[in-house]
């Protein structure tokens, strides 16, 4: 997942963005300014942390919006948040733009934020426990010289009368088959719904699609179905976002 991304602001507009805890949001206040704007001030809600970055120098912004900064092409904002939102778009950063006279905002740009916590976790050391947000995840690399979570190749046949090994089909016929796979949990925490246009997507690259298969258990309590969601021709899967604190269990085979 990207550790930082850029959001485009526009004066006279409110922009909605999802913020993932542990990342940075960057936004350019200069290109979003109206004609005639000379300075700007900032306000933000209490769970939002904003820094004005000019020529590589960062300055933290107080919540009260009293300070003014000169607009220049090198001025950007770096935004982080400290906790998941309870409501969609409930946190905000407001940029007030002032003209030469500088007495009253001539315009405003609004960044309305929804913070969510996302963690994709696996039983990296195969001790039977899916750990939570392993700090070394960012350095994991795929391949023979790689490091990270161990993934077993599921090359036996739980159903002997089938011609293919388990890793060569997209079906799960028994719970025994799941025991050969690694567990993976997608943990999310956030408001009841995401802002319009946002969804959570699991994806794999084309080059990895023939090396891994991911399954999801539907109806875990009755009439279980094991659905193949990633691998082979399936490069992405849209996850149903349920809101609050949620854990979705997946099974991964090599």
């Amino acid at each position: 997942m990207l550790r930082e991304r850029t959001v485009r602001l526009q004066y006279g507009s409110r922009v909605e963005a999802v913020y993932v805890l542990g990342t940075y949001l960057w936004t350019d206040v200069y290109s979003a300014a109206p004609a005639g704007a000379q300075t700007f001030s900032l306000k933000h809600s209490e769970h939002v942390w904003v820094e004005v970055v000019r020529d590589g120098e960062a300055e933290e912004v107080a919540t009260n919006g009293k300070q003014r900064w000169l607009l220049s092409p090198s001025t950007t904002l770096r935004v982080t948040m400290s906790q998941a939102s309870t409501e969609a778009s409930s946190d905000k950063v407001t940029v007030n733009y002032y003209d030469e006279e500088g007495s009253i905002p001539i315009d405003q740009a609004g960044l309305f934020l929804t913070a969510i916590e996302i963690s994709l976790d696996v039983d990296a050391d195969r001790d039977g426990v899916v750990e939570k947000n392993n700090p070394k995840k960012a350095s994991w690399t795929w391949g023979p010289e790689g490091q990270g979570a161990i993934l077993l190749v599921n090359c036996d046949r739980e159903t002997p009368w089938l011609p293919k090994e388990d890793c060569r089909d997209e079906k799960v016929y028994s719970k025994e088959d799941l025991k050969d796979m690694s567990q993976m949990i997608l943990r999310t925490k956030g408001p009841d719904r995401l802002p319009a246009g946002y969804e959570i997507v699991l994806y794999i690259s084309m080059s990895d699609s023939d090396k891994v298969g991911v399954f999801y258990v539907e109806n875990p309590f009755f009439g279980q179905r094991y659905i193949h969601i990633l691998g082979r021709r399936k490069l992405y899967h849209v996850v149903k976002y349920t809101g609050g604190s949620a854990e979705l269990l997946f099974f991964v085979e090599g």
Epitope: G12, S13, R14, P34, A35, G36, K43, T63, N64, G65, D99, E100, E101, S103, I104, P105, I106, D107, Q108, G110
Partner: antibody, heavy 121, light 105 residues
Framework: QVQLQQPGAELVRPGASVKLSCKAS????????MNWVKQRPGQGLEWIGM????????YYNQMFKDKATLTVDKSSSTAYMQLSRLTSEDSAVYYC??????????????WGQGTSVTVSS | QIVLTQSPAILSASLGEEITLTCSAN?????MHWYQQKSGTSPKLLIY???NLASGVPSRFSGSGSGTFYSLTLSSVEAEDAADYYC????????FGGGTKLEIK
Amino acid sequence: QVQLQQPGAELVRPGASVKLSCKASGYTFTSYWMNWVKQRPGQGLEWIGMIDPSDSESYYNQMFKDKATLTVDKSSSTAYMQLSRLTSEDSAVYYCARKDYYAYGGAMDYWGQGTSVTVSS
Amino acid sequence: QIVLTQSPAILSASLGEEITLTCSANSSARYMHWYQQKSGTSPKLLIYSTSNLASGVPSRFSGSGSGTFYSLTLSSVEAEDAADYYCHQWSGYPTFGGGTKLEIK
């Protein structure tokens, strides 16, 4: 629907103060600036000031800096304007008006019915 | 602060006539808003950002202009259009024009 409710009239003595109210409904009170505008009988409109109900940040027309004080009560979604040391020059209709920087180009899209203030002994 | 001057102060028009109200600024304004105020009522947003019609406003109203000169045009005056019309800008300090009173003959 959006409504800004203001009392119809206030009669006050010269030198006294008056606190005008503007009760908002039909929208999220803290998401829009509230403006106050003065209109003397048979005259045009004069901008007094505005307040951001989310944090009470306010701006004033210099001419009203010592005359008007803007406040809000978020719990009741009500904006207030206190006018002090009243003279006959302050006899006018006072409107509250909502301003949205993110729509209508920042124009005032909804107005209250206005409160008529008469300063008389 | 920007001073807005509206002309004419009073305009008498016949039903169906096309009329233009003007608003000039003593220095450049980013854009202009227009309000209509009928007798005994509060102002109502008519046109915002120079040329955009507010919701529910009939299409016979239109606005144009830039810099220091702006105008409001009614393509065909109707009886219900009798009102005061104010231009309003928001650069530096917000200011209003003195108004134009539209009377129907």
